[in-house]
Amino acid sequence: DSEEDEEHTIITDTELPPLKLMHSFCAFKADDGPCKAIMKRFFFNIFTRQCEEFIYGGCEGNQNRFESLEECKKMCTRDNANRIIKTTLQQEKPDFCFLEEDPGICRGYITRYFYNNQTKQCERFKYGGCLGNMNNFETLEECKNICEDGPNGFQVDNYGTQLNAVNNSLTPQSTKVPSLFEFHGPSWCLTPADRGLCRANENRFYYNSVIGKCRPFKYSGCGGNENNFTSKQECLRACKKGFIQRISKGGLIKTKRKRKKQRVKIAYEEIFVKNM
């Protein structure tokens, strides 16, 4: 399973070495869900770096939920020695790297990049602005990271991404962060945009960890996750500058079902945290 091979780096405390997650969902907060059952389950706590017990309501929630302590450990923990070593893994290119350049049916003349399987290099092309295919990147760097081989014939990064064919916004399938990329910001910046379960359509921003940008999305008004900001600036402040941030233990606050903006005092500076 390619997910097994990929690791995710989050630094959550100044005293601790970089945390490498085997699966991105290990970074999700424990989510009891909206139902009212009382079920003992386990989740991986990125702050204590341990699997811990929580009470699950019986429906919805997220993937950071395990029937047993052993299952949680198996999915989310590794010995520290493995965690600290950066690994460059031989990985397959995503299938879309082998698609031919496709300008799409519109004519907007946007400069984009595609991986040319003949030359084995990323090259510039004129994109029409709509449709086309997934071999289509906003930057040369993005194209190289995803489709070109590294110096030893290794795949540099395999993001496991889904490219919206028109927005050409890379949306992580399971928010995989490339194994060579040390993200020092809040863990929720690595989670995918989550609309939530209600019916509103509020304009919000989320941090897309694959392309390193804050992107708009529509929030339903309830549920979702903490990768949810009312402005682009707020999103950038919390996630884009994550390369220099360290989070003290206990940085997240869990409140019941209300999503209100709260200021959380953190050791190094104030950042905004969204609560479920």
Partner: antibody
């Protein structure tokens, strides 16, 4: 003024091939500012896009997954037309079939449509 | 596939009165440059569809200014400021954000 004139049989037997042609006047099938599509309409499915072809530096096509294994859309530059072939038809393929021009420059939409051809799949 | 959901499916109208049709997409249709990848079509009885509104809010050539399109993200609206008898037919929204191109199920506008 662009015009699209459709032709082809209205009755096709199950398992056979549905073939329709769309003759273009007022534009060129090789134009790099247009794309050419087939869309069908049936009471059960509403408007269903089937596929599209377009010429840029070369010819491109895209097909709906639902018909991808059975469909071919081809340009005929000498006659300035394009055709639809749908293989192994079943009664489910009974519909009104439209050809349409996608305006790649201004509208980014289907701005001209053929008159429609009702195709019935029945033995 | 992106699912386009229109409401209402049937809209009885009075000539001279305004009318509004809603279209909701299962994912956002807004591109990073601000373009909205949504079109509106009208299919009059016995005719082929015709393009009314492109890129979410632009009227196609020859379309009267009583028609207007608005919305962004996943929620879009087609408004007719004062309905005329010739406006009857079925209205469809269509997305071109990703393949396959998909249409709404249609809203039938008829005179009361």
């Amino acid at each position: 003024q662009v015009q699209l004139q459709q032709s082809g049989p209205g009755l096709v037997k199950p398992s056979q091939t549905l073939s329709l042609t769309c003759a273009i006047s007022g534009d060129s099938v090789s134009s790099n500012s247009a794309a050419w599509s087939w869309i069908r309409q049936s009471p059960g499915r509403g408007l269903e896009w089937l596929g599209i072809i377009y010429k840029r530096s070369k010819w491109y096509n895209d097909y709906a997954v639902s018909v991808k294994s059975r469909i071919t859309i081809n340009p005929d530059t000498s006659k300035n037309q394009f055709s639809l072939q749908l293989n192994s038809v079943t009664p489910e393929d009974t519909a009104v079939y439209y050809c349409a021009r996608w305006d790649s420059d201004k509208h980014w939409g289907f701005d001209y449509w053929g008159q429609g051809t009702l195709v019935t799949v029945s033995s | 596939d992106i699912v386009m959901t229109q409401s209402p499916l049937s809209l009885p109208v009075t000539p001279g009165e305004p009318a509004s049709i809603s279209c909701r997409s299962s994912q956002s249709l807004v591109f990073s440059d601000g373009n909205t990848y949504l079109n509106w079509y009208l299919q009059k009885p016995g005719q082929s569809p015709q393009l009314l509104i492109y890129k979410g809010s632009n009227r196609a050539s020859g379309v009267p200014d009583r028609f207007s399109g608005s919305g962004s993200g996943t929620d879009f609206t087609l408004k007719i400021s004062r309905v005329e008898a010739e406006d009857v037919g079925v209205y469809y929204c269509q997305q071109y954000d990703s393949y396959p191109l998909t249409f709404g199920q249609g809203t039938k506008v008829e005179i009361k």
